[in-house]
């Protein structure tokens, strides 16, 4: 018969590969049919008989065409820093993400691992590059004629107000004061805000043509306690 | 990033033979389907098979069984593809894709090789 | 083999128009229905697999729908970079097969 009249289980002919959502079974040498996402192998085929499939039982899941045993394990629930941005299914893992104010200081291949508040930088320092995702906010000191009076993890260093006379000079971590009751200001008043990073990650997963039959491991590093970087505050 | 890219241009008298190229990169090579495709001027799309890169293993269209070969060198992550005993109506664009074999589609393409048969 | 037609062959439309192509197979390919853009002298972009399932970097004004034998694809709100050739493929049973293509052209 031809390859593509021929039903699962068939020995495909020599030199070809088995057709579409089709696996080569190494022990019964014939092209069986594969399990679809949301299911597993309960029975793998034989020379006379094809792969029966299962449905994945509760917080297990297989996302991909597979010939798998046993469905992959959803990983465990969110943490409180965290948001659940996918649900565990019988197709797709649990995904966490980041809260707002936090960012993801160890990933994984969907999601987050391990998040971590964003910094917040303390008076006399503005945000030099925002918080993201994947990556904490940094601080700096404010140059001369600029100052923040905030303990942020958003506000940036602002201009001086300038004063026609100046009761008590400005400083990093303080605005000028004026004894003219009509100051003049390079920029709007009150506080600069940057955008909260979003902790939203792309849902999107390529299927792959050869699913791996090894379940993922995961794990946690150890993470020591760290001193707070120049500018920000521990907590 | 994940890209194929394929050999220039060729011209050929009907009866002969053209190997075309498709040197993959950003990806495990061995991992993926390599899928080849042909466009006839103002035409549409057809299917001329794929080749498995870990194993050689090809599935052809049955179109093109007999006049076609795909071969594969992993050490340089190149697929091939041959036609023989070419017609003029095998003057077309030759394209090489990645393909997925789950859900039959094709996500990466090259930017493809005309082939041109005239006497 | 399995005949793909997708209809209409060439459409006119303008910026910001909301635009449906659909493609018909001649047997039932469950959700297997992908949808190409191609644009003059380039190789064809994966928009959408299995039906509905946007391919990455595709923005989301592109969708898809239908199941069985009748399928769409819509663009919600045309660009000017959508301008170009769509064609359907099956990828149900083999040999894979394509529409032979609608021209969207710009009105």
């Known amino acids: 018969l031809p390859a593509q009249v021929a039903f699962t289980p068939y020995a495909p002919e020599p030199g070809s590969t088995c057709r579409l959502r089709e696996y080569y079974d190494q022990t019964a040498q014939m092209c069986c049919s594969k399990c679809s996402p949301g299911q597993h192998a309960k029975v793998f085929c034989t020379k006379t008989s094809d792969t029966v499939c299962d449905s994945c039982e509760d917080s297990t899941y297989t996302q991909l065409w597979n010939w798998v045993p046993e469905c992959l394990s959803c990983g465990s629930r969110c943490s409180s820093d965290q948001v659940e941005t996918q649900a565990c299914t019988r197709e797709q893992n649990r995904i966490c993400t980041c809260r707002p104010g936090w960012y993801c200081a160890l990933s994984k291949q969907e999601g987050c691992r391990l998040c971590a508040p964003l910094r917040k930088c303390r008076p006399g320092f503005g945000v030099a590059r925002p918080g993201t995702e994947t990556s904490d906010v940094v601080c700096k000191p404010c140059a001369p004629g600029t100052f923040s009076n905030t303990t942020s993890s958003t506000d940036i260093c602002r201009p001086h107000q300038i004063c026609n006379v100046v009761a008590i000079p400005g400083n990093a971590s303080m605005d000028a004061v004026c004894t003219s009751t009509s100051p003049t200001r390079s920029m709007a008043p009150g506080a600069v805000h940057l955008p909260q990073p979003v902790s939203t990650r792309s849902q999107h997963t390529q299927p792959t043509p050869e699913p791996s039959t090894a379940p993922s491991t995961s794990f946690l590093l150890p993470m020591g306690p760290s001193p707070p970087a120049e500018g920000s505050t521990g907590d | 990033q994940v890209q194929l890219v394929q050999s220039g241009a060729e011209v050929k008298k009907p009866g002969a033979s053209v190997k075309v190229s498709c040197k993959a990169s950003g990806y495990t090579f061995i991992t993926y389907d390599i899928n080849w495709v042909r466009q006839a001027p103002g035409q549409g799309l057809e299917w001329i098979g794929w080749?498995?890169?870990?194993?050689?293993?090809?599935q052809f269209n049955e179109n093109f069984k007999g006049r076609v070969t795909m071969t594969t060198d992993t050490s340089t992550s190149t697929a091939y593809m041959e036609l023989r005993s070419l017609r003029s109506d095998d003057t077309a664009v030759y394209y090489c894709?990645?393909?997925?074999?789950?859900?039959?589609?094709?996500?990466?393409w090259g930017q493809g090789t005309t082939v041109t048969v005239s006497s | 083999d399995i005949q793909m037609t997708q209809s209409p062959s060439s459409l006119s439309a303008s910026v910001g128009d909301r635009v449906t192509i659909t493609c018909r197979a001649s047997q039932d390919i469950s959700n297997y229905l992908n949808w190409y853009q191609q644009k003059p002298g380039k190789a064809p972009k994966l928009l959408i697999y299995f039906k509905s399932k946007l391919h990455s970097g595709v923005p989301s004004r592109f969708s898809g729908s239908g199941s069985g034998t009748d399928f769409t694809l819509t663009i919600s709100s045309l660009q000017p970079e959508d301008f170009a050739t769509y064609y359907c493929q099956q990828g149900n049973t083999l040999p894979l097969t394509f529409g032979g293509g609608t021209k969207l052209e710009i009105k």
């Open positions: 080749i498995y890169p870990r194993d050689g293993n090809t």
């Open positions: 894709a990645r393909g997925d074999r789950d859900y039959g589609y094709f996500d990466v």
